[in-house]
């Protein structure tokens, strides 16, 4: 029961996390205009991974896409790549984890197979979460660097009457969404990996005892057989499930509402 709960919770947490990573990647507010020096701006600038936007006092918002690949900073390209890799891995992980869920039965899939799938999806979620966290962190670092550089050059042409104020950018909402979402995906992945340990059948060595009618000696054969790990083979073998021994037949003879054949 605890394993199912851990697996289910891991799946849900990862699902929320990946949805958050997708949302963060699509959001326009990765960086927003710093209003510290000019809190009464009539023009508010913000930028995303794919386009930059300007919102005027009226609410009129104008967004312009980055219609170039070669002209973009390498760091921005790297962030895009990390986020996309995170989404792709997360999506594959979700697909795998759906089939790995203990509450869903697909044909005669054994728990060992589900354990492997759970582990695979868990690792995918962990890597996905790390990609998102890395991507957001790289962008944040880029912002911090640019912020202090533009602060140093805040006013150009101070010698004359004319001032050119450089727009400074600070952390946007998407960064926080990305960090939280990446963290959730990572946590979900860890939970899936933990659930995998509980799902995997114990490598129990049953000792075969041979009794001889005439002799007094008892022969012990170590390692009689291992619990079945194949698909559909040795279905009559006894396995340990959460402390209770049941046969595969017993497990399959009571289909629940969650079973899909």
């Amino acid at each position: 029961m605890a394993v199912t709960a851990c697996q289910g919770l891991g799946f849900v947490v990862s699902l929320i996390g990946i949805a958050g990573i997708i949302a963060a990647t699509c959001m326009d507010q990765w960086s927003t205009q710093d209003l510290y020096n000019n809190p009464v701006t009539a023009v508010f600038n913000y930028q995303g991974l794919w386009r930059s936007c300007v919102r005027e006092s009226s609410g009129f918002t104008e967004c312009r896409g980055y219609f170039t690949l070669l002209g973009l900073p390498a760091m921005l390209q790297a962030v895009r790549a990390l986020m996309i890799v995170g989404i792709v891995l997360g999506a594959i992980g979700l697909l795998v984890s759906i089939f790995a869920l203990k509450c869903i039965r697909i044909g005669s899939m054994e728990d060992s197979a589900k354990a492997n799938m759970t582990l695979t999806s868990g690792i995918m979620f962990i890597v996905s979460g790390l990609c998102a966290i890395a991507g957001v962190s790289v962008f944040a670092n880029m912002l911090v660097t640019n912020f202090w550089m533009s602060t140093a050059n805040m006013y150009t042409g101070m010698g004359g009457m004319v001032q050119t104020v450089q727009t400074r950018y600070t952390f946007g909402a998407a960064l926080f969404v990305g960090w939280v979402a990446g963290g959730l995906t990572l946590i979900g992945g860890v939970m899936m990996c933990i659930a995998c340990r509980g799902l995997a059948p114990e490598e129990t060595n049953y000792k075969a005892v041979s009794y001889h009618a005439s002799g007094h000696s008892v022969a012990y054969k170590p390692g009689g057989f291992k619990a079945s790990t194949g698909f559909g083979s040795n279905t009559k073998n006894k396995k340990i499930y959460d402390g209770g021994a049941r046969t595969e037949d017993e497990v399959q003879s009571y289909p629940s509402k969650h079973d899909y054949v």
């Epitope: 205009q33 000019n38 009464v40 701006t41 009539a42 023009v43 600038n45 913000y46 930028q47 930059s52 936007c53 300007v54 005027e56 006092s57 009226s58 609410g59 009129f60 104008e62 312009r64 004319v162 001032q163 050119t164 104020v165 450089q166 727009t167």
Partner: antibody, heavy 119, light 113 residues
Framework: EVQLLESGGGLVQPGGSLRLSCAAS????????MHWVRQAPGKGLEWVAY????????YSTDTVKGRFTISRDNSKNTLYLQMNSLRAEDTAVYYC????????????WGQGTLVTVSS | DIVMTQSPDSLAVSLGERATINCKSS????????????LTWYQQKPGQPPKLLIY???TRESGVPDRFSGSGSGTDFTLTISSLQAEDVAVYYC?????????FGGGTKLEIK
Amino acid sequence: EVQLLESGGGLVQPGGSLRLSCAASGFTFSDYGMHWVRQAPGKGLEWVAYISRGRSTTYSTDTVKGRFTISRDNSKNTLYLQMNSLRAEDTAVYYCARGSYYGNAMDYWGQGTLVTVSS
Amino acid sequence: DIVMTQSPDSLAVSLGERATINCKSSQSLLNSGNQRNYLTWYQQKPGQPPKLLIYWASTRESGVPDRFSGSGSGTDFTLTISSLQAEDVAVYYCQSAYSYPFTFGGGTKLEIK
């Protein structure tokens, strides 16, 4: 047709108060930010205050801060300017203007109401 | 606050001739985010409220005759009337629309020579 009609102007003594109103019609009032702009007799235009469409944001020029308050009642399609501690230099024609959807401009203006501050 | 300086204070131009009004801001009005200049031009005829002519430094408001055009970027802007008509006699104001408080230029009085 967009119409803005100011009212509430008149003669007031220094230190006195006055409340200007601007009745809007011909457009969805709650969709637009609104401005007050004044013009002293024979002088140029001076922007006074702005209120966003949702009433959440207000800005005003330093010379009137703490004395003038801009507000709006979207249910009545009316813009207000509460003027306290009036000074002689506040004497002007006060215009209400609609904030344009583009370029932070002011696309429609009322005919104005004259406020005279004199003892 | 941004200071707007208009020149000349007054201008006399013959009918059909070109009229040019200049406006200079103390701070750049060019927004890097959309590469637009937040400068507006208004026309005020005697006894009337101002009328919007041009926003974003060069975009004509609907209904404004095409003889009116705006140009410039950053801190230097120009309003041009390509062929002056009698009805163009007015005071013209430039206005910063980049940050609050909005500020107007002193105005340029345009008359017929």
